[in-house]
Interface confidence: low
């Protein structure tokens, strides 16, 4: 029990979560591709979720996807349509803290 507590303490002591750069707003044209970048770092490595207009982003095969990157996460939308406009938020957590950033796709 003691050793388990010590390990937990060490993890808590060294854990951190930072937003490295605010998300940019994107202005683009119909039919084009837009990318939004969520630049966060942390220990343990954060879990990142994407939201559009406060709702979880649902990936669409070959059109809308997000993936982990060395700097956090990237959301890509291909073949943009008018319904894609709105505000996008990434929410990152390391299990203890939460940071978020918002960008707008015009």
């Amino acid at each position: 029990p003691t050793s388990s507590w010590n390990i937990s303490s060490e993890l808590n002591k060294d854990s951190y979560l930072t937003l490295d750069e605010p998300m940019n707003n994107i202005t683009t044209s119909l039919g084009q591709t837009a990318e939004l970048h969520c630049k966060v770092s942390g220990n343990p490595p954060p879990t990142i979720r994407w939201f559009k207009n406060d709702a979880p982003v649902v990936q669409e095969p070959r059109r809308l996807s997000f993936r982990s990157t060395i700097y956090g996460s990237r959301l890509r939308i291909r073949n943009l349509d008018t319904t894609d406009t709105g505000y996008f938020q990434c929410v990152a957590t390391n299990g203890k803290e939460v940071v978020s950033s918002t960008g707008v796709l015009f």
């Epitope: 998300m23 979720r49 207009n53 406060d54 709702a55 979880p56 505000y87 918002t102 960008g103």
Partner: antibody, heavy 117, light 107 residues
Framework: EVQLVESGGGLVQPGGSLRLSCAAS????????IHWVRQAPGKGLEWVAA????????SYADSVKGRFTISADTSKNTAYLQMNSLRAEDTAVYYC??????????WGQGTLVTVSS | DIQMTQSPSSLSASVGDRVTITCRAS??????VAWYQQKPGKAPKLLIY???SLYSGVPSRFSGSRSGTDFTLTISSLQPEDFATYYC?????????FGQGTKVEIK
Amino acid sequence: EVQLVESGGGLVQPGGSLRLSCAASGFTFTSYGIHWVRQAPGKGLEWVAAIYPHSGFTSYADSVKGRFTISADTSKNTAYLQMNSLRAEDTAVYYCARTSYRGFDYWGQGTLVTVSS
Amino acid sequence: DIQMTQSPSSLSASVGDRVTITCRASQSVSSAVAWYQQKPGKAPKLLIYSASSLYSGVPSRFSGSRSGTDFTLTISSLQPEDFATYYCQQYYWYPGTFGQGTKVEIK
């Protein structure tokens, strides 16, 4: 503790102006959207306007577009609703609310705006 | 605009009753639906988000569910403090739209 406190309501004549304030505390102001929602006496909830202080993104309901302006002062953690050319149908309790992926998770206590001659 | 059609507009119930309120979205809103409780002279309070997630501090007698574009708020055993007006809201399509409200009154 997250808190939103509205102020600035009152009685105003048709055609007049008012500025509402929403003072936020207990959270990172620039990480959330701030919305204004109003409720006319005995009626339901009506969305009015929103601002995302980090990006400066704003939007308005058609019923107030061109008359109301939403803004935010990030140094004061305060959002504002400037209301011009007020009409009798703008009479309502005005609430500010914080939005997150959970919807409108925190609301202020509301401030009453009465437009009457 | 997305319409959220809420029913009934009012209902009368007794303490201990099971109460169900429904909202139908005019088109898909995924699971991005919240439910709020409002008492006279007070601000709305969040009860349920993402259609079925119970917000922190809300009693477990409140629950939400989704079936396609139909959303339901259920109070399993109505308590005296639950007499209030309830609103649904979709927040999938910006900026979000509210239902008309359901007033729960004492029978």
